[in-house]
């Protein structure tokens, strides 16, 4: 049997946010139901995690031996602290789209570990804000965006923006 440390060396995690409790659930991406040491985990989910606080989970299973895999859960900031904002200037709304993630509230997570991603059509931008220029007037554009904390996606949003009519004579 392999050690649990070896078996689950590359385990990945998804973070799910509960807007009512303002707590996260970490979903462990494994095929079998694992044990989580002192932490309670139901169906491979660790519940009631506070934003920006680390939690340590010892992952074990009868298919592997000691030592257990010690997984540090780096809990992201609360989702409601981020808003996707349309920053397009009215006078340029016929050929321009501007989108920006705004942090409307402070948090204690290290901002160095936050990355932002936009995808508009086949264009990908790793920025907190984007400005698309020279677009067609009166066209619909869809932009998907996500925020990652330590490379784990914890929130995403999509915007469908229709550019304005062009000015007469253009």
């Amino acid at each position: 049997k392999p050690t649990c440390d070896e078996k689950y060396a590359n385990i990945t995690v998804d973070y799910l946010y509960n807007k009512e409790t303002k707590l996260f659930t970490a979903k462990l991406n494994v095929n079998e139901n694992v044990g989580c040491g002192n932490n309670t985990c139901t169906n491979n989910e660790v519940h009631n995690l506070t934003e920006c606080k680390n939690a340590s989970v010892s992952i074990s299973h009868n298919s592997c031996t000691a030592p257990d895999k010690t997984l540090i859960l780096d809990v992201p900031p609360g989702v409601e602290k981020f808003q996707l904002h349309d920053c397009t200037q009215v006078e340029k709304a016929d050929t321009t789209i501007c989108l920006k993630w705004k942090n409307i509230e402070t948090f204690t997570c290290d901002t160095q570990n936050i990355t932002y991603r936009f995808q508009c059509g086949n264009m990908i931008f790793d920025n907190k804000e984007i400005k698309l220029e020279n677009l067609e007037p009166e066209h619909e554009y869809k932009c998907d965006s996500e925020i990652l904390y330590n490379n784990h996606k914890f929130t995403n949003a999509s915007k469908i923006i229709k550019t304005d009519f062009g000015s007469p004579g253009e």
């Epitope: 920006k100 901002t111 907190k128 984007i130």
Partner: antibody, heavy 119, light 113 residues
Framework: EVQLVESGGDLVKPGGSLKLSCAAS????????MSWVRQTPEKRLEWVAY????????YYPDTVKGRFTISRDNAKNTLYLQMSSLKSEDTAMYYC????????????WGAGTTVTVSS | DVLMTQTPLSLPVSLGDQASISCRSS???????????LEWYLQKPGQSPKLLIY???NRFSGVPDRFSGSGSGTDFTLKISRVEAEDLGVYYC??????????FGGGTKLEIK
């Protein structure tokens, strides 16, 4: 270590131009909105320019609008302030300061660079 | 523009005393999102300003608990419960609610009596 270092301050004649730079290190510069704040010889603090994290939005008070231009190069982790049509009342210590998004706070300031406008 | 008026201009205190600085805005600085972005900065001689308090009453990390902020609407106060020698300098209030027209108060110099 998180650091902001301003440079480019000088003695310049009224009507002249000057470009200030602010080199950032130790943090994810492209995640931060940035501002220039100046301190007059009378020790008053005045906000003079703001730029959003990706350089999309810029704002200025009426006192410098049309004369000052804030810009940034996220690849070089550098903030700039281009000043033209300088007046004697622009004489001040110029600080760059980071603000994590528009509503947070100025948590890191540089040591400042001195601009003197005099004939 | 939002005018921020600080009083007093100068505040002579004895070490160990309480100090209180007032900041009044010319209009409400409650943002439409419900928050009030009122900050306090301290500038010691020969240094750049340092953040003390944000959002009226929240102490920035590393700021001693003898510093406290309070107020609402247009009237705000910074209190230092027991002044120490390292607290001397110029205190500035700042409003960040009316974006992007940021404004600082005129400053209050805290000095030894």
């Amino acid at each position: 270590e998180v650091q902001l270092v301003e440079s480019g301050g000088d003695l310049v004649k009224p009507g002249g131009s000057l470009k200030l730079s602010c080199a950032a290190s130790g943090f994810a510069f492209s995640n931060y909105d940035m501002s220039w704040v100046r301190q007059t010889p009378e020790k008053r603090l005045e906000w003079v320019a703001y730029i959003s994290s990706g350089g999309v939005s810029t704002y200025y008070p009426d006192t410098v609008k049309g004369r000052f231009t804030i810009s940034r190069d996220n690849a070089k982790n550098t903030l700039y302030l281009q000043m033209s049509s300088l007046k004697s009342e622009d004489t001040a210590m110029y600080y760059c300061a980071r603000r994590y998004d528009v509503w947070w706070y100025f948590d890191v300031w540089g040591a400042g660079t001195t601009v003197t406008v005099s004939s | 523009d939002v005018l921020m008026t600080q009083t007093p201009l100068s505040l002579p205190v004895s070490l160990g005393d309480q100090a209180s600085i007032s900041c009044r805005s010319s209009q409400s600085i409650v943002h439409s999102n419900g928050n009030t972005y009122l900050e306090w900065y301290l500038q010691k001689p020969g240094q750049s300003p340092k953040l003390l308090i944000y959002k009226v009453s929240n102490r920035f990390s590393g700021v001693p608990d003898r510093f406290s902020g309070s107020g609402s609407g247009t009237d705000f106060t910074l209190k230092i419960s027991r002044v120490e020698a390292e607290d001397l300098g110029v205190y500035y209030c700042f409003q960040g609610s009316h974006v992007p027209m940021y404004t600082f108060g005129g400053g209050t110099k805290l000095e030894i009596k």
